[in-house]
């Protein structure tokens, strides 16, 4: 019940997550830049992963895709690729651990191949939040190493005077948006593969092996109390094969390669 | 290299019109508000008229009623109508817009001033 309760809250959470990486990706709000009043109107700009976005006080809001820029810097298109590898892996993992989920049956499947999939789904989880997480820092760290503006540069063109207008680049909404969600991502997948070692089939550490003489009437059985007093898997007293080894479980079953030892 | 290059001034008679054009090129990526300032001599730089991409207008008193800004977002051009025009309006008129390259990332808006045109109000 345990390792069910763990399995689908694991897989819940981590859904939780990608949704938000997904979310935090499409998301407009990577970076702000302060509000600025211009004698026209007040303004507010803010830039994502895909577009830059442009509100006026008015309510007015217009975006524009980075299509049309001339260089994109290769740390943006990094972040870009470490969202989409989280997006996939995530959905990939998702899939994955539907059909590993304990409480949905799907033919004849074994708990075995279950607690694979749980851990390749776990597994999945874990690097899909990890790519978020890397993803949405790197893009924090070019916000703060690179893009800080503390000063206003002016210099004069052949158009005229040319000034800044902003001043600072700030984190936008998305960044916690990503690290909340690839935190989550990354919980659900630690959750999956711990929910993985409840799944699989303990094996036991030995199989108790019924021996004795042809002739005799007294078997030999090792394993303690249980096996010489006739309390393992012979409970209803059958008679051994004579000549025979056989291990506990096969007791009752078809002869094997063990009874001619 | 971005610059705005204005255009359509001159010498008007009281009471006449003029029409004043501001084509901003370079490679620009967005333009988000873009206005008109006048200096006559021995004054201060003052905003006439201003216009935001979503067409938020604002206009000095003294101009309320006789002048018009428009702009053309897909030409990245801004106009002035100025009808009965006053001797008071003569002055040198700039083009001010704020504005982003297409040179960069982030997205850094620069306030981007043209070299003006004389306007001259004049009997």
């Known amino acids: 019940m345990a390792v069910t309760a763990c399995q689908g809250l694991g897989f819940v959470v981590s859904l939780i997550g990608i949704a938000g990486i997904i979310a935090a990706t499409c998301m407009d709000q990577w970076s702000t830049q302060d509000l600025y009043n211009n004698p026209v109107t007040a303004v507010f700009n803010y830039q994502g992963l895909w577009r830059s976005c442009v509100r006026e006080s008015s309510g007015f809001t217009e975006c524009r895709g980075y299509f049309t820029l001339l260089g994109l810097p290769a740390m943006l298109q990094a972040v870009r690729a470490l969202m989409i590898v989280g997006i996939v892996l995530g959905a990939i993992g998702l899939l994955v651990s539907i059909f590993a989920l304990k409480c949905i049956r799907i033919g004849s499947m074994e708990d075995s191949a279950k607690a694979n999939m749980t851990l390749t789904s776990g597994i999945m989880f874990i690097v899909s939040g990890l790519c978020a997480i890397a993803g949405v820092s790197v893009f924090a760290n070019m916000l703060v190493t690179n893009f800080w503006m503390s000063t206003a540069n002016m210099y004069t063109g052949m158009g005229g005077m040319v000034q800044t207008v902003q001043t600072r680049y700030t984190f936008g909404a998305a960044l916690f948006v990503g690290w909340v969600a690839g935190g989550l991502t990354l919980i659900g997948g630690v959750m999956m593969c711990i929910a993985c070692r409840g799944l699989a089939p303990e094996e036991t550490n030995y199989k108790a092996v019924s021996y004795h003489a042809s002739g005799h009437s007294v078997a030999y059985k090792p394993g303690g109390f249980k096996a010489s007093t006739g309390f393992g898997s012979n409970t209803k007293n059958k008679k051994i094969y004579d000549g025979g080894a056989r291990t506990e479980d096969e007791v009752q079953s078809y002869p094997s390669k063990h009874d001619y030892v | 290299e971005v610059q705005l290059v204005e255009s359509g001034g001159g010498l008007v008679q009281p009471g006449g019109s003029l029409r004043l054009s501001c084509a901003a090129s370079?490679?620009?990526?967005?333009?988000?508000?873009m206005g008109w300032y006048r200096q006559a001599p021995g004054k201060q730089r003052e905003l006439v008229a201003g216009?935001?991409?979503?067409?938020?207008?604002r206009y000095a008193d003294s101009v309320k009623g006789r002048f018009t800004i428009s702009r053309d977002n897909a030409k990245n051009t801004l106009y002035l109508q100025m009808n009965s025009l006053r001797a008071e309006d003569t002055a040198v008129y700039y083009c001010?817009?704020?504005?982003?390259?297409?040179?960069?990332?982030?997205?850094?808006?620069?306030?981007?001033w043209g070299q003006g045109t004389l306007v001259t109000v004049s009997s």
């Open positions: 001010n817009a704020d504005l982003a390259t297409a040179t960069s990332w982030p997205v850094r808006y620069l306030e981007v």
């Open positions: 216009i935001s991409t979503g067409g938020t207008t």
């Open positions: 370079g490679s620009i990526f967005s333009i988000n508000v």
